[in-house]
């Protein structure tokens, strides 16, 4: 808390300018009018204030707006945003995408801070859903943003927003998140033709069910190994050797290098060895010829 002291004669600030960098902390407190600061916030960013001086400016704004800053001030906070706590930000009502962009720009190149996370949360909750423009903006600043959301939060993403998602935005998503995003992507891209559809849906296939993988295997898609390895194990297991061969096309040759890893490892164990032998890849561990295969999941369903 800065002690209240009278402003020395002739030092009263008429505007926010470079002369203020020579003011001591107590002089800033005494000589800068909070209302003037609020109207000229856009100038603060261009002036090389020290962190201690920025603390004083923040304190003045806090006193002026105890219920939270108006958006006209928030939009021009610039580096002062880095001084805000999540508690400060929870008082804000940010509705403009331009404001959001301006503040994200301040934090650009850094990890997502608690302040930024709170800001985004406030913004998205205010909008009611993650629309395409917001998603575009957030993933541009934080490619991992989408995968930082819970499945529940992802359920508020409308299918139309999926068009803004780039493959790298899904790199860190886990299967539970892809389970939510895949049906939305399927809906978003449903009117595209075969090859174009596959290019768009490919990144989301970690959430695809068996039936959709079987359908894709009939379309000469030549899925690459990186995509295949991210498929749900339970979705891959029921696929036949012929279906996997059609699904992967020339990439089927990569199965040998991946025989130790899921889902390939578990899939091999479910196939007949003589079917695996038809691939000519030396994949071992299938069900020996002459053995009867019992589908226990089917048996459980019947009992």
């Amino acid at each position: 808390e800065v002690e209240k002291t009278a402003c020395p004669s002739g030092k009263k600030a008429r505007e926010i300018d470079e002369s203020l960098i020579f003011y001591k902390k107590w002089e800033l407190e005494a000589c800068v009018d909070a209302a003037l600061l609020a109207t000229q916030m856009d100038r603060v960013n261009a002036i090389p204030f020290t962190y201690e001086q920025l603390d004083v400016l923040k304190h003045k704004l806090d006193e002026l707006y105890p219920q939270g800053y108006p958006e006209s001030v928030i939009q021009h906070l610039g580096y002062l945003f880095l001084k805000m706590s999540p508690e400060d930000i929870r008082k804000w009502n940010v509705t403009s995408l331009e404001t959001l962009k301006a503040l994200l720009e301040v934090n650009k190149g850094h990890e997502m801070s608690p302040q930024v996370a709170t800001l985004i949360d406030r913004f998205v909750k205010g909008r009611g859903q993650l629309d395409k423009d917001t998603l575009d903006t957030l993933t541009a600043f934080y490619p991992g943003y989408l995968c930082s959301l819970s499945p529940e939060e992802l359920s508020s993403v409308p299918p139309s927003s999926i068009w803004a998602v780039r493959p790298q935005d899904l790199d860190t998503c886990d299967p539970r998140q892809l389970d939510v995003l895949y049906p939305k992507a399927r809906l978003a891209f449903q009117n595209m033709n075969g090859s174009e559809y596959f290019v768009k849906i490919q990144s989301f296939l970690g959430g695809a069910p068996t039936e959709d993988l079987k359908a894709l295997s009939q379309q000469n898609v030549s899925m690459d190994l990186a995509t295949f390895m991210k498929l749900r194990t339970d979705a891959v297991l029921p696929l036949t050797v012929a279906e996997v061969q059609k699904l992967l096309g020339p990439h089927v040759e990569g199965l040998k290098a991946e025989e130790r890893h899921r889902p390939v490892r578990d899939w091999i164990l479910r196939q007949r060895q003589d079917d695996l032998d038809t691939l000519g890849l030396g994949l071992q561990g299938g069900i020996p010829n002459g053995y009867l295969v019992l589908d226990l999941s089917m048996q459980e369903a019947l009992s």
Epitope: A257, E258, E259, R260, L281, G285
Partner: antibody, heavy 121, light 107 residues
Amino acid sequence: EVHLQQSGPELVKPGASVRIPCKASGYTFTDYNMDWVKQSHGKSLEWIGDINPDNGGTIYTQKFKGKATLTVDKSSSTAYMELRSLTSEDTAVYYCARRLHYYGSSGLDYWGQGTTLTVSS
Amino acid sequence: DIQMTQSPASLSAYVGETVTITCRASGNIHNYLAWYQQKQGKSPQLLVYNAKTLADGVPSRFSGSGSGTQYSLKINSLQPEDFGSYYCQHFWSTVWTFGGGTKLEIK
């Protein structure tokens, strides 16, 4: 610590066979494939084949089919390579090497010290 | 089977220099590529796997790059201990061939 221990140098006569052991320690033997590599004096490396110790599944390069046989003894965590009908062309250093256990597993991360085989009458 | 063509076959450079070794595959190997270093009389050592991932303990002056059929290993600011032979190896399909090797000598 992962270690692959191979046997010392072998001197054998043409037409004979030899079995080279590679004893693994410091990791779960059945969790990683074992590859075998040949290096003739002053030459490049030549991949022979690969064995999955868990199920005994093998794969060989065409040149070594009928020449090399890869086996494992799970109880002693040892991989073996048998070379038969030996000729002077088989004189080389033979390495066993463990294959990486990551997705996109393109690499041999631990190597034995090599066994020098000399075929001479 | 996919063949690996490595170049140059030999190379001499000064300590502190930057060198690049390349490997061309006869078909697309989808980044399933490793690089090894071998010193005289020693076993090879893994440097890079998956075309660009540095193996544990490998200095950051080594880097792998490439895709499809063209791959390279770059060594920045060569150190005396970097001299030796370098080999690439692919892991696509079922025959995992090595390149012919590059002998890196000190000038």
